[in-house]
C-alpha cells in the first residue's frame, strides 16, 4: 500500500489520543526500555509502511502483535484515514490466517514495539518538520539521526 | 486528594452473583489502568483483573476467568467487577488499585478494600 | 503463569539495615514493585520499577535488581517498618497479567 495520500495530522491525532497510550502501556515496567532503534524511516509515508509492517506482519519470535489493542487501533486509524487502505488488507488478513502460529517471546515482542514507538516519534518529528517548512521556507530539513 | 472507595461487598451463597464497585475521585480516572486485587484472611495479596485505560482491553487470574467481568465507565469515575458463580474460595477483601501510568507500573493508590463472603 | 518467592519472614535489629527478595523469571523481563501492608490497612507503594520512590516515602526503602531476583532495602530499619511486605511485577508467560509474590513478615526487633 501507497501511504501518499493519508491525512497525516488526522493519524498523529488518533496516535496522541490512543495508540500512544497503548503502546507505552505496553512497555511499562520493563527493564528493557533502552532497546537499541534498528528501524528507522525517512518521511511520513515511509514511517507509516515500516509502522504497518511492524505492526501486523508476524517475525519468528513475536507473532501476536497484531491482535493488540494498538495493533486494533492502528489498523482502525490507517483504514480511516488512508484512502483504499482497508482493500488492502483484505487479502493479506487472509494470508495471514494461512500461517503457522509460532512461539511467542515476551522480550521479542517487547523489542518490537520498542521500535514501532520510535519510529510512530519519528513519524511526528517528520510532520512537524513539515509544518514547520510551510511557515519558514529557509527551515533547512534535516534528518536528526 | 487522591481516592478510591470500594463498595458492594457483601454476603452471599455459594453460585450467586455480585457486583463490585469503585468511585475514583481526585485524579484522571481515563489516563490509567485499573486493578482488581483480593486478600483472603490471613492470606496474601493475589491479582484478580486489569482493565486498559479505556476498557478496551480486559484480563483476568486464570483463578477467576469467565466468572468475573472487568469493567469501568470513564464517565462516572467508576470501575466494576461483576462476580458470577461464586466459590467459598472468593471469599476476600477485594481492593481496587490504580495502575501504570507510562512507563511505571505499579499499583500507587488503593482503596480500603471491601469485603465479600462466600458462605452457605 | 509465572510465580514470586519470597521468604515468608525476615527479622532485623531496630536501626540495622534488611534486606527483602523476590525471585522469579519475569524479573529477568519486568521490574519488581513493593508494597507494604501493615495490620488492618490497604497496601502501599513504596517502591515501583527501577528504583522509584513515590512521594511520601523515606528514602530509607530503596530497590534494586539482578537477573532473577529483585530486592528491597531498608536502611536504618524503624519500628514503623514492621509489617508485611509485597513483591509484583508483570507476568513474564502473559505480559497482559500481573504476579504478586507470596509476602515477607519484616519484624523489627
Known amino acids: 500500500y501507497d501511504f501518499t495520500n493519508c491525512d497525516f495530522q488526522k493519524i498523529e491525532a488518533d496516535y496522541l489520543r490512543t495508540i500512544s497510550k497503548d503502546l507505552i502501556t505496553y512497555m511499562s515496567g520493563t527493564k528493557s526500555t533502552d532497546f537499541n532503534n534498528t528501524v528507522s524511516c525517512s518521511n511520513r509515508p515511509h514511517c507509516l509502511t515500516e509502522i504497518q509492517s511492524l505492526t501486523f506482519n508476524p517475525t519468528p519470535r513475536c507473532a501476536s502483535l497484531a491482535k493488540e489493542m494498538f495493533a486494533r487501533k492502528t489498523k482502525a486509524t490507517l483504514a480511516l484515514w488512508c484512502p483504499g487502505y482497508s482493500e488492502t488488507q483484505i487479502n493479506a488478513t487472509q494470508a495471514m490466517k494461512k500461517r503457522r502460529k509460532r512461539k511467542v517471546t515476551t522480550n521479542k515482542c517487547l523489542e518490537q514495539v520498542s521500535q514501532l514507538l520510535g519510529l510512530w516519534r519519528r513519524f511526528i518529528r517528520t510532520l512537524l518538520k513539515q509544518q514547520h517548512h510551510h511557515h519558514h521556507h529557509d527551515y533547512k530539513d534535516d534528518d536528526d539521526k | 486528594e487522591v481516592q478510591l472507595v470500594e463498595s458492594g461487598g457483601v454476603v452471599v451463597q455459594p453460585g450467586g452473583s455480585l457486583r463490585l464497585s469503585c468511585a475514583a475521585s481526585g485524579f484522571t480516572f481515563d489516563d490509567f489502568t485499573m486493578h482488581w486485587v483480593r486478600q483472603a484472611p490471613g492470606k496474601g495479596l493475589e491479582w484478580v483483573s486489569l482493565?486498559?485505560?479505556?476498557?478496551?482491553?480486559?484480563y483476568y487470574a486464570d483463578s477467576v476467568k469467565g466468572r468475573f467481568t472487568i469493567s469501568r465507565d470513564n464517565s462516572k469515575n467508576s470501575l466494576y467487577m461483576q462476580m458470577n458463580s461464586l466459590r467459598t474460595e472468593d471469599s476476600a477483601l477485594y481492593y481496587c488499585?490504580?495502575?501504570?501510568?507510562?512507563?511505571?507500573?505499579?499499583?500507587?493508590?488503593w482503596g480500603q478494600g471491601t469485603t465479600v463472603t462466600v458462605s452457605s | 503463569s509465572s510465580e514470586l518467592t519470597q521468604d515468608p519472614a525476615v527479622s532485623v535489629a531496630l536501626g540495622q539495615t534488611v534486606r527483602i527478595t523476590c525471585q522469579g523469571d519475569?524479573?529477568?523481563?519486568?521490574?519488581a514493585s513493593w508494597y507494604q501492608q501493615k495490620p488492618g490497612q490497604a497496601p502501599i507503594l513504596v517502591i515501583s520499577d527501577k528504583n522509584n520512590r513515590p512521594s511520601g516515602i523515606p528514602d530509607r526503602f530503596s530497590g534494586s535488581s539482578s537477573g532473577n531476583t529483585a530486592s528491597l532495602t531498608i536502611t536504618g530499619a524503624q519500628a514503623e517498618d514492621e509489617a508485611d511486605y509485597y513483591c509484583n511485577s508483570r507476568d513474564s508467560s502473559d505480559n497482559h497479567l500481573v504476579v504478586f509474590g507470596g509476602g515477607t513478615k519484616l519484624t523489627v526487633l
Open positions: 488499585a490504580r495502575g501504570p501510568y507510562y512507563y511505571f507500573y505499579g499499583m500507587d493508590v
Open positions: 482493565i486498559s485505560w479505556d476498557g478496551g482491553s480486559t
Open positions: 519475569s524479573l529477568r523481563t519486568y521490574y
